[in-house]
């Protein structure tokens, strides 16, 4: 019996087609992805093959203005239109709190939404009961297939699930649900979830009875043969894991942003064992036409977005200096504003010992592309912010050692004075440079804001301590020459859309007046510094 699994993950509000790098589509003849194009390909496969499942491994939420305006209603509407068979909850599905998941998505999806390791307690338990499930048995042709869901255990640090949801260890939570499916005589079981490729492989290895793992969160691109675009494969598709009980378990993921449609064909014997598996992600490029009826629907929904982008979010009473003359040479108040918004967006009081789990932000000055003039009545719109942050990136959470941060700050000024983009803007960090010293030895003071304290204050950076830092995904991926971040980071979780973070902060504050306040200091002459 043959099953075709079509899968997406980490689509992040890319409902419209995008450019090759998943940013805004500029030249339509070269654009990729989008739900209209995805639908064409899915329908083509459904017509050609008998047993097809379309699955999503989470993080449909968050990523473009579509989510900012429609808040998840767009996800339910277009996933219903594409007739997804099941979805696992990702961490970003909780970005607008539990209510922001229940109302627009859980109540409106015409397909099951899954997670076995999220348990509701207190008053939420009865409210959310039955709206998401630990597993689902799906009829496929004359057979049934079991799907068990899972979600990153880190979600409370990455999103806003509130205090009434408990995120359990994935493997511990999955095993009893798979066992339950086995007692129902369901012998073909797919684990569908959102915890990243490393956890996907562990699930394949450890959870008895799981035949296939379809994952997300780590934006992992797998491919067999010559890859069709710019993404470099992290391994073959499917990635085969040998389970502890000696079975070969295929593990798949399909990069992100709806650029590819994962396509896996599995052959099962009559006892539900996997005999063979093969496939590859399908690049959704312009050779695949956009479905006209879905496209028309997209255009109808688009109208509200254009109206939104010119409405006032809040006001500034000071000039927001995002000029390259400032932000690539010294502390600039636009950099301070953005970093403050980044920290504010990551306030998660999950532990009494810590006022917050993260206090530090770094931001490459080259990523700030425009100032905002306060003499336009002080008005700030989404359109204004899109000029400041035009790349459609995310502000991510990483964990790295103090020694890596020190290297990053040395890199920040290693060729100071040439208007290069790697000069870092900061939050929760005080840095002093001596630019008369040789490159690689210019950081003379680096103090960071404590987290495990009731009164936040600045302490010297410790080289072997592990710190959490919020930064643009561009930096986490080693952009602007920050190879040391990419090479040495201990953990990386993708975060919220950059513009969305800043716009939410401005709306929350109503009136802003960021200052240049001595976060970054530099001098060009020898000083005597006493290190304590």
């Amino acid at each position: 019996w043959e099953l075709t699994i079509l899968h997406t993950n980490d689509v992040h509000s890319r409902l419209e087609q995008t450019s090759e790098d998943s940013s805004k589509c500029v030249n339509a003849s070269r654009c990729m992805g989008g739900v209209a194009r995805l639908f064409t390909k899915v329908q083509q496969i459904r017509r050609a093959e008998p047993n097809v499942l379309l699955l999503d491994a989470g993080d449909q939420y968050q990523g473009t203005i579509w989510f900012t305006v429609y808040k998840g209603a767009e996800v339910a509407h277009f996933m219903n239109a594409l007739r997804y068979d099941a979805m696992a909850l990702g961490n970003h599905e909780f970005d607008n709190g539990v209510e922001g998941l229940i109302e627009p998505l859980l109540k409106e999806a015409k397909f099951p939404i899954l997670s076995a390791n999220i348990k509701a307690k207190g008053p939420l338990a009865s409210q959310i009961s039955g709206l998401y499930l630990p597993y689902k048995v799906l009829p496929v042709g004359d057979e049934v297939v079991g799907i068990v869901g899972y979600t990153s255990k880190e979600t409370p640090f990455l999103s806003n699930p509130g205090t009434n949801l408990v995120f359990e260890d994935e493997i511990t939570a999955l095993q009893p649900e798979v066992d339950k499916l086995k007692t129902l005589n369901v012998n073909k079981i797919i684990a569908l979830g959102h915890s990243g490729f490393e956890m996907d492989k562990l699930i394949a290895q450890k959870v008895r009875g799981v035949d296939v793992v379809v994952g997300g969160h780590s934006n992992t691109f797998l491919y067999t043969g010559n890859p069709p675009s710019k993404e470099v494969p992290a391994g073959k598709y499917p990635f085969i894991v040998t389970s502890d009980d000696g079975r070969k378990v295929p593990v798949v993921q399909a990069y992100a942003f709806g650029k590819y449609l994962g396509y896996l064909k599995i052959e099962f014997d009559e006892r539900g064992n996997v005999i063979s598996s093969h496939g590859n992600p399908i690049l959704l490029n312009s050779s695949i036409p956009e479905d006209p009826s879905i496209k028309a629907d997209i255009n109808k929904w688009r109208i509200k977005l254009d109206n939104y982008s010119t409405q006032e979010l809040g006001k500034t009473i000071v000039y927001l200096d995002g000029s390259s003359q400032s932000c690539r040479f010294r502390e600039c108040n636009m950099g301070n504003l953005i970093c403050d918004a980044m920290i504010n967006n990551n306030l998660r009081h999950t532990d009494e010992m810590f006022w917050n789990h993260v206090s530090m932000c770094i931001l490459n000055g080259g990523g700030i592309r425009s100032p905002i003039d306060e003499r336009n009545n002080g008005t700030i719109t989404w359109e204004n912010l899109a000029a400041v942050l035009p790349f459609g990136g995310t502000f991510d959470l990483v964990q790295l050692k103090g020694s890596t941060l020190k290297k990053a700050f040395e890199h920040s000024v290693h060729r100071y004075g040439q208007s290069t983009g790697e000069f870092l803007q900061v939050g929760g960090i005080h840095v002093v440079y001596d630019l008369s010293r040789k490159p690689g030895d210019r950081v003379v003071k680096l103090d960071v804001l404590c987290t495990k304290c009731r009164v936040p204050s600045y302490d010297p950076l410790k080289m072997d301590e592990v710190y959490k830092v919020i930064l643009p995904n561009f930096l986490a991926n080693g952009g602007d020459g920050f190879q040391m971040i990419k090479d040495e980071l201990l953990r990386h979780d993708s975060g919220d859309q950059d513009i969305n973070v800043v716009s939410t902060y401005i709306s929350k504050m109503k009136v802003i007046y960021p200052a240049v306040e001595g976060r970054i200091k530099a001098h060009h002459h020898h000083h005597h510094h006493h290190h304590h």
Partner: nanobody
């Protein structure tokens, strides 16, 4: 919370008719496939009939084809099972059940939400 409550069961003579109702609360009916199942004493639970989300597709077990009709009133959040030409072998507890998905099925394993059941006895 999601709830399904069956009603309309009772004692009826062979050849008679009954109309079972299943009232759904806590969710919008048109997002769910609904199925009717029955369990005769000492027997496995069996699928009788099911209806897709919109009510556009309906399926019946061979044993009830031409005699039973499933229908739904999504506005009233109620599903009905009209049972005609009843036979003694139709006796059992009738359950209605629901699940979200695109493909209606008579396989009990795919249903996630169940009512408590209503008893039907066909006897002279």
């Amino acid at each position: 919370a999601l709830q399904l409550v069956e009603s309309g069961g009772g004692l009826v003579q062979p050849g008679g008719s009954l109309r079972l109702s299943c009232e759904v609360s806590g969710f919008t009916l048109d997002y769910y496939n609904i199925g009717w199942f029955r369990q005769a004493p000492g027997k496995e639970r069996e699928g009788v009939s099911c209806s897709s989300q919109s009510g556009g597709s309906t399926y019946y077990a061979d044993s009830v084809k031409g005699r039973f009709t499933i229908s739904r009133d999504n506005a009233k959040n109620t599903v009905y099972l009209q049972m005609n030409s009843l036979k003694p072998e139709d006796t059992g507890v009738y359950y209605c059940a629901a699940y979200r998905g695109w493909h209606p099925s008579l396989d009990a394993r795919v249903y996630d939400y169940w009512g408590q059941g209503t008893e039907v006895t066909v006897s002279s």
